[in-house]
């Protein structure tokens, strides 16, 4: 259950999907990937204030305990709730092949 | 694919399962839960250095981009990989009921 989508820290400051442009070199993939040469990486970035997009009961517990013991228990963290698949053309021992990766690009985000 | 379980920061410093004792009051549950009166909350706490317990390709990408752009891209975060169910005896309008929660206690951890 997503608990709230209103960000009390101001627009764009809380957990949400961001796009970061990255080259094969940036990703350390130049030695095994041929295409694409550049990836629009979607990832989850931002703060997780109290009950914002809480993924589940565990996230709600974490919020409560972080409020009580901030030095011991970290705040919930902004991570992917689901992924978009992506295809890579990769080098193999014998040549190239097209491979689909299901866990590469974040599709949407929540706090956990 | 878990990439590595060796913590380069020293024993116990990296992402792993911790137990935090919490009362119903700590959790904000006193008004709707009768038992247990205290919960041994298992949660995932610790750093996620390069490729440590990387949950998937996305986590590996995040590590690479964090190294390049630490102010833009956060390091991967230590979160539950799976959960242990837990039963709560909760108050209802008509009395009490026994309810199982599948997403309350972390079972093991990874970095994402």
């Amino acid at each position: 259950a997503r608990n709230g989508d209103h960000c009390p820290l101001g627009p764009g400051r809380c957990c949400r999907l961001h796009t970061v442009r990255a080259s094969l070199e940036d990703l350390g993939w130049a030695d095994w990937v041929l295409s694409p040469r550049e990836v629009q990486v979607t990832m989850c970035i931002g703060a997780c204030p109290s009950q914002f997009r809480a993924a589940n009961m565990h996230a709600q517990i974490k919020t409560s305990l972080h409020r009580l013991k901030p030095d011991t228990v970290p705040a919930p963290c902004c991570v992917p709730a689901s992924y978009n698949p992506m295809v890579l053309i990769q080098k193999t021992d014998t040549g190239v092949s097209l491979q689909t990766y299901d866990d590469l690009l974040a599709k949407d985000c929540h706090c956990i | 694919a878990r990439n590595g379980d060796h913590c380069p920061l020293g024993p116990g410093r990296c992402c792993r399962l911790h137990t935090v004792r919490a009362s119903l009051e700590d959790l904000g549950w006193a008004d709707w839960v009768l038992s247990p009166r205290e919960v041994q909350v298992t949660m995932c706490i610790g750093a996620c250095p390069s490729q440590f317990r990387a949950a998937n390709m996305h986590a590996q990408i995040k590590t690479s981009l964090h190294r390049l752009k630490p102010d833009t891209v956060p390091a991967p975060c230590c979160v539950p990989a799976s959960y242990n169910p837990m039963v709560l005896i909760q108050k209802t309008d008509t009395g009490v009921s026994l309810q199982t929660y599948d997403d309350l206690l972390a079972k093991d951890c990874h970095c994402i």
Partner: antibody, heavy 118, light 107 residues
Framework: QVTLKESGPGILQPSQTLSLTCSFS??????????VSWIRQPSGKGLEWLAH???????RYNPSLKSRLTISKDTSSNRVFLKITSVDTADTATYYC??????????WGQGTTLTVSS | DIVMTQSQKFMSTSVGDRVSVTCKAS??????VAWYQQKPGQSPKGLIY???YRYSGVPDRFTGSGSGTDFTLTINNVQSEDLAEYFC?????????FGGGTKLEIK
């Protein structure tokens, strides 16, 4: 496994509109990087690339035919469509659809033949 | 548009020989070139991607080379099943363009 199959009318008269369908299985056009291209080949001649549609609905056309071409997709039913308006005898050819990952044409359909004749 | 020229329309070779099919681009296309094989009555099949990388499952007697404007497909130890037409293609820029094809005949 990946398969693509083209279907079309077989015969058209000049000035009519050609509607082609590429039905595919074994992959999804919602996958980032995936696309489908249409290519044609007049009998005994070379290959001519016509149009391409990407997973994100970005479309590319051969400029020499752009005003006559429309490519579209139905991701949920795994189909890609191509329309060519005002066909002429010069459009007589075998029409192929091919799967692409980025720019990698790795699977082709068997082709569908069009004859334009009055 | 980038023009891909395969100057030899036909090439004749014998089983066991080595043959080289050439392709010239009208402008620099880097290594963004693919090669396709089309057997009689069949649809094209990918052989080489990015000028020199074999498609998965392609026998290693097929090799690609070149960059910029000049590209070569070499078939070592030609087999009878290699009787086909070979097309180069550039994907450096739209529109994608193909060479006119080179038909390989087996003596």
């Amino acid at each position: 496994q990946v398969t693509l199959k083209e279907s079309g009318p077989g015969i058209l008269q000049p000035s009519q509109t050609l509607s082609l369908t590429c039905s595919f299985s074994g992959f999804s056009l919602s996958t980032s990087g995936m696309g489908v291209s249409w290519i044609r080949q007049p009998s005994g001649k070379g290959l001519e690339w016509l149009a391409h549609i990407y997973w994100d609905d970005d479309k590319r056309y051969n400029p020499s035919l752009k005003s006559r071409l429309t490519i579209s997709k139905d991701t949920s039913s795994n189909r890609v469509f191509l329309k060519i308006t005002s066909v002429d005898t010069a459009d007589t050819a075998t029409y192929y659809c091919a799967r692409t990952g980025w720019d990698f044409f790795d699977y082709w359909g068997q082709g569908t033949t069009l004859t334009v004749s009055s | 548009d980038i023009v891909m020229t395969q100057s030899q329309k036909f090439m004749s070779t014998s089983v066991g020989d080595r043959v080289s099919v050439t392709c010239k681009a009208s402008q620099n296309v880097g290594t963004n070139v693919a090669w396709y094989q089309q057997k009689p009555g069949q649809s094209p099949k990918g052989l080489i991607y990015s000028a020199s990388y074999r498609y998965s499952g392609v026998p290693d007697r097929f090799t690609g080379s070149g960059s910029g404007t000049d590209f070569t497909l070499t078939i070592n130890n030609v087999q009878s099943e290699d009787l086909a037409e070979y097309f180069c293609q550039q994907y450096n820029s739209y529109p994608y363009t193909f060479g006119g094809g080179t038909k390989l005949e087996i003596k």
